[in-house]
């Protein structure tokens, strides 16, 4: 018996088409992604294999003024229309909270949404209860699949899941429920979840009767033969691991942002073992066209969109200096509103010791791409941010030990005066350099604001301590030259929309007047 | 609006079968499954099974597997449900109820009775 | 296979009262439970899917609740025309299971 999946995740919000990067389509004959093209080559497959599941793995929350201006509504209304089977909540779908989710997603969505390892308590459990599942059973043909869902257990780190959620170890949660299918003769089970490619092959090891694994989070792509686009494999389409109960277990993801669609074929036998798997993800390139109905519905819902890039935030009553020949040479406010927005939108008390589970920010002067006059009556609207952050981009939460941290500073000065990009702007860090000094060497005092503290101080960074930092994307990545943040780093979470962070600052804020204020020193 | 239109009562000798048609109108017939559920005189409900419109696949209630056939005609928007090798007890009144998106029953015919009967 | 029992198999009561019929599944059905509401020579009218979510057109005195393998349908203020025999179902896997029923009279 076959049975074909074709998978999305980390879908960001990209409901239209984008450019190869993922970012906005310029050049409409070159773009890539977007439901409408999606639908199209998902209704090809339907159309031509008899067993066919569409999965999304999490994530579809966050990434563009899509999701700003219709908060999850849009992915329910879209997805329903490209009849997704099942849905792993991903840790994005957090973002505004467990409301946030609840009203426009898990009320709205007309397809299981799965989670095992997240458990309600207090008054929130009788108010989610039913509205999330951990599995979901579904006739396929003449056969029926199990589908497991699963979350990263650091949600409550990377968004605003509140304190009524656990996040339980997925493999400890799984497990259970995977038993609980098999002696109801349920012998063909999918993992569909969210918590990263590391995770997923854990999944694939240890859970007993887990047959295939469908994951998110770590924006993975895999790929057997010469890969379509810019994207390199980090391994073969599908994974296959070798479970501690001896069983080849392939595990898949698809990217991120919509650009591919997974495409899988698992063969079982008459007691539901898997025989053999094989597929790709298909680049969804121009070569595919949108569907017209669906483009139709787009066009409509895209109207509001482009009235709210031109309301007003907030306010500014000073001069945002975002100009390079400012934040590309030393401490500029638009920088450090920026650091400080990235700060603000990660703030969650973690416990009793710490005030906050991070507190520093960097963020390279070269990705400040524009000015904000306070004259213009002191507005701030969203397209003023877009042209200040054009690339759209996320701010990231990573993990770095303290030496890495040393190394990023001393390469933001290691060519210094020549306008280059990779001149750090910061938050919740004391720096001065020493120009006198030969590059590698002229980061004379590094102090970083503490965590662990009742009331925040900076104290020398520790060079074998690990600190949590938020950074762009672009860093994460190991842009500008930032190579050892990308060799050295031991954790990387993806996280929100760059703009959406500083909007929702401004907008919070309402009136904001960012000051240079000695974050950055020369000596 | 949505509607199930089942065939007329039939009247069968014991080991003969039955074939019931169950017409959907009122939304799209290929993006719903179809459930089978029968009800013996003065007894509750009991599932028979479920066919998906799309390929024709079913699953079946072991308890009649090897006796019940689901089939479809998407051209017609119709499912039927043939029962063989009749007996007595199989006398009740049969249901073709549409499943939702969570595949549960939402939309009923309004039953089509078999009498088995020598 | 589930066995779901359902509770009283017959309930009397009067128009204006509140009424709860329950349904104990015989391992946790995650949620997966519909009612079912079925007059005297006519087809079951589906009321509740997915434990607590109401078919659209269906009264607001209906409700749903419950999780794990022990659930209610409750009519807040009993009316004549609601005079039925109510099911209950699992659909959590297959084969699907009904409750026996709770054949409901008007006092």
């Known amino acids: 018996w076959e049975l074909t999946i074709l998978h999305t995740n980390d879908v960001h919000s990209r409901l239209e088409q984008t450019s190869e990067d993922s970012s906005k389509c310029v050049n409409a004959s070159r773009c890539m992604g977007g439901v409408a093209r999606l639908f199209t080559k998902v209704q090809q497959i339907r159309r031509a294999e008899p067993n066919v599941l569409l999965l999304d793995a999490g994530d579809q929350y966050q990434g563009t003024i899509w999701f700003t201006v219709y908060k999850g509504a849009e992915v329910a209304h879209f997805m329903n229309a490209l009849r997704y089977d099942a849905m792993a909540l991903g840790n994005h779908e957090f973002d505004n909270g467990v409301e946030g989710l609840i009203e426009p997603l898990l009320k709205e969505a007309k397809f299981p949404i799965l989670s095992a390892n997240i458990k309600a308590k207090g008054p929130l459990a009788s108010q989610i209860s039913g509205l999330y599942l951990p599995y979901k059973v579904l006739p396929v043909g003449d056969e029926v699949v199990g589908i497991v869902g699963y979350t990263s257990k650091e949600t409550p780190f990377l968004s605003n899941p509140g304190t009524n959620l656990v996040f339980e170890d997925e493999i400890t949660a799984l497990q259970p429920e995977v038993d609980k299918l098999k002696t109801l003769n349920v012998n063909k089970i999918i993992a569909l979840g969210h918590s990263g490619f590391e995770t997923d092959k854990l999944i694939a090891q240890k859970v007993r009767g887990v047959d295939v694994v469908v994951g998110g989070h770590s924006n993975t792509f895999l790929y057997t033969g010469n890969p379509p686009s810019k994207e390199v494999p980090a391994g073969k389409y599908p994974f296959i691991v070798t479970s501690d109960d001896g069983r080849k277990v392939p595990v898949v993801q698809a990217y991120a942002f919509g650009k591919y669609l997974g495409y899988l074929k698992i063969e079982f036998d008459e007691r539901g073992n898997v025989i053999s798997s094989h597929g790709n993800p298909i680049l969804l390139n121009s070569s595919i066209p949108e569907d017209p109905s669906i483009k139709a519905d787009i066009n409509k819902w895209r109207i509001k969109l482009d009235n709210y890039s031109t309301q007003e935030l907030g306010k500014t009553i000073v001069y945002l200096d975002g100009s390079s020949q400012s934040c590309r040479f030393r401490e500029c406010n638009m920088g450090n509103l920026i650091c400080d927005a990235m700060i603000n939108n990660n703030l969650r008390h973690a416990d009793e010791m710490f005030w906050n589970h991070v507190s520093m920010c960097i963020l390279n002067g070269g990705g400040i791409r524009s000015p904000i006059d306070e004259r213009n009556n002191g507005t701030i609207t969203w397209e003023n941010l877009a042209a200040v952050l054009p690339f759209g981009g996320t701010f990231d939460l990573v993990q770095l030990k303290g030496s890495t941290l040393k190394k990023a500073f001393e390469h933001s000065v290691h060519r210094y005066g020549q306008s280059t990009g990779e001149f750090l702007q910061v938050g919740g860090i004391h720096v001065v350099y020493d120009l006198s000094r030969k590059p590698g060497d002229r980061v004379v005092k590094l102090d970083v604001l503490c965590t662990k503290c009742r009331v925040p101080s900076y104290d020398p960074l520790k060079m074998d301590e690990i600190y949590k930092v938020i950074l762009p994307n672009f860093l994460a990545n190991g842009g500008d030259g930032f190579q050892m943040i990308k060799d050295e780093l031991l954790r990387h979470d993806s996280g929100d929309q760059d703009i959406n962070v500083v909007s929702t600052y401004i907008s919070k804020m309402k009136v904001i007047y960012p000051a240079v204020e000695g974050r950055i020193k020369f000596s | 609006q949505v509607q199930m239109k089942q065939s007329a009562a039939e009247v069968r000798k014991p080991g003969a079968s039955v074939k019931v048609s169950c017409k959907a109108s009122?939304?799209?017939?290929?993006?719903?499954?179809m459930d089978w559920v029968r009800q013996a005189p003065g007894q509750g409900l009991e599932w028979m099974g479920d066919?998906?419109?799309?390929?024709?696949?079913?699953i079946y209630n072991q308890k009649f597997k090897g006796r019940v056939t689901m089939t479809i005609d998407t051209s017609r928007s119709t499912a039927y449900m043939e029962l063989r090798s009749l007996r007595s007890d199989d006398t009740a009144v049969y249901y073709c109820?549409?499943?939702?998106?969570?595949?549960?029953?939402?939309?009923w015919g309004q039953g089509t009775t078999v009498t088995v009967s020598s | 296979d589930i066995q779901m029992t359902q509770s009283p198999s017959f309930l009397s009561a009067s128009v204006g009262d509140r009424v709860t019929i329950t349904c104990k599944a015989s391992q946790d059905i995650n949620s997966q439970l519909s009612w079912y509401q079925q007059k005297p020579g006519k087809a079951p009218k589906t009321l509740i899917y997915r434990a607590n979510r109401l078919i659209d057109g269906v009264p607001s005195r209906f409700s749903g609740s419950g999780s794990g393998t022990d659930f209610t349908l409750t009519i807040s203020s009993l009316q004549y025309e609601d005079m039925a025999t109510y099911y209950c179902l699992q659909y959590d896997v297959f084969p699907r299971t009904f409750g026996g029923g709770t054949k409901l009279e008007i006092k």
């Open positions: 109820a549409r499943t939702n998106w969570d595949y549960a029953m939402d939309y």
């Open positions: 066919i998906n419109p799309n390929n024709g696949g079913t």
């Open positions: 009122g939304y799209t017939f290929t993006d719903s499954n």
